[in-house]
Amino acid sequence: RPSFSLVEDTTLEPEEPPTKYQISQPEVYVAAPGESLEVRCLLKDAAVISWTKDGVHLGPNNRTVLIGEYLQIKGATPRDSGLYACTATRTVDSETWYFMVNVTDAISSGDDEDDTDGAEDFVSENGNNKRAPYWTNTEKMEKRLHAVPAANTVKFRCPAGGNPTPTMRWLKNGKEFKQEHRIGGYKVRNQHWSLIMESVVPSDKGNYTCVVENEYGSINHTYHLDVVERSPHRPILQAGLPANASTVVGGDVEFVCKVYSDAQPHIQWIKHVEKNGSKYGPDGLPYLKVLKHSGINSSNAEVLALFNVTEADAGEYICKVSNYIGQANQSAWLTVLPKQQAPGREKEITASPDYLEKLEFRHDSGLNDIFEAQKIEWHE
């Protein structure tokens, strides 16, 4: 059994304008250092599953085991925290599922369920069969450890019965939990034996104990809440994109770069070109050309469309993404075949060329200018 469990966002937030590049918030898994993590890729009918962490390919090693749709990390450390993705490659398409792993000393897990089942938790016992409090639905209490992203709603439940009907009170870290202990207070739904805290913040972290009692006895149950904090991060590119492509002379082709980013990213499509018959400048750095970049009024920069291609269009195309926080890049190759040859589907792989990570770039003029790889500067 995994030592953590996914927490779903149950808050209802006002509708916001769609964000062009943001993939929906990934699910959060939390584990304590030293524990073993096991995650199942929630994608169906996968022929091949590949894994990435923070956009970088994840392969097996002495602590990472990849078996079928399962990823297992032995002896987790805080360095294992990050944005993970599993990509299922099928015969006709591929799909990616994202999730966050947070390895923290404040271990937590669990999920918030809606009160759809409502009042069946409220057990009313008639007659003279006096009875001390007892739990009526222990399944809803199994997840003692709850990891919740900041600003979400948390619900703890202690469904109980007894005769007379027991009362319920809540403690935080062993002391009476008062409304004034948190901004916005909290709600207690006695009918549902639940405690609800909206818009949780880091100061809400701690142990929450429900005490259920009547004159014949008392029972209690403790939950641990960890509030997972979010900060903006550099862009992360979906593994496998852009994908290698091939087409015939005169054909059309599209490269797609899918970005996960909190902060809105700038996207640049860059191609290796020749200048005076050479692909490299005197300093050994490649000549590059910015084909397209995102700007305030640009069209969908995630897609680079090439129409009526010629043999000169063949080569490597780089998707370089940067936001206020940092950068990421991946590339793909275009093969242009003579017209009489029918193109075959290229194997979809993604290269992250080392020189993009190591070199400086320069781009300080128009979009179509060729520049030597020294510094790329943003000009909107």
Partner: antibody
Framework: QVQLVQSGAEVKKPGESLKISCKGS????????IHWVRQMPGKGLEWMGA????????TYSPSFQGQVTISADKSISTAYLQWSSLKASDTAMYYC??????WGQGTLVTVSS | DIQMTQSPSSLSASVGDRVTITCRAS???????SNWYQQKPGKAPKLLIY???NLQSGVPSRFSGSGSGTDFTLTISSLQPEDFATYYC?????????FGQGTKVEIK
């Protein structure tokens, strides 16, 4: 913990050169832009430029282009802001910031004859 | 360059008050990239809100951000003694990443 530590206050004369530093620790230095921000006495914040230490990608505000140079040495997780010839109007507090969330304590530069 | 104009430039308020600061961009900031910072005298700025509406880790939930296009708002739902400071907006849509001129929140 994640932090940026800046070099100490400097008192210089007009025409002199200066290089101030910003050392990152507690995180992967190469994975985040380092931004430089100026705050003149009693005034607001002005974005000067940024560098991505992994590949030394730099960008400058037009107001500061040619006036300062931003550089980084990723081997020692340090970013720099330098002037070749200081002016009295360069007197200000200079902050470095990792992205938007982590800021250095600031370096006060005083240029006076 | 995109200019960011904050209003008011200063305001006086009491503990418990609801405070709203607005920032207007000189052109549409599509897609709504703005940060809000708090700065106290002699201290470095502190990030409160990123990308218009995301609360930064560790920032109290009384702070909230909203807006799109050209108009952005920072709201403090119930002003606390430690909130008296200067607040800045910043656009991070296109270079140069300009700041607003600041709004000083003082005790009434």
């Amino acid at each position: 913990q994640v932090q940026l530590v800046q070099s100490g206050a400097e008192v210089k004369k007009p025409g002199e050169s200066l290089k101030i530093s910003c050392k990152g620790s507690g995180y992967s230095f190469t994975n985040y832009y380092i931004h430089w921000v100026r705050q003149m006495p009693g005034k607001g914040l002005e974005w000067m430029g940024a560098i991505y230490p992994d590949n030394s990608d730099t960008t400058y505000s037009p107001s500061f282009q040619g006036q300062v140079t931003i550089s980084a040495d990723k081997s020692i997780s340090t970013a720099y802001l330098q002037w070749s010839s200081l002016k009295a109007s360069d007197t200000a507090m200079y902050y470095c910031a990792r992205g938007a969330d982590i800021w250095g304590q600031g370096t006060l530069v005083t240029v006076s004859s | 360059d995109i200019q960011m104009t904050q209003s008011p430039s200063s305001l006086s308020a009491s503990v418990g008050d609801r405070v709203t600061i607005t920032c207007r961009a000189s052109q549409d900031i599509d897609p709504y990239l703005s940060n809000w910072y708090q700065q106290k005298p002699g201290k470095a700025p502190k990030l409160l809100i990123y990308d218009a509406s995301n609360l930064q880790s560790g920032v109290p939930s009384r702070f909230s951000g909203s807006g799109s296009g050209t108009d952005f708002t920072l709201t403090i739902s119930s002003l606390q003694p430690e909130d008296f400071a200067t607040y800045y907006c910043q656009q991070t849509t296109s270079h140069p990443y300009t700041f607003g001129q600041g709004t000083k929140v003082e005790i009434k």
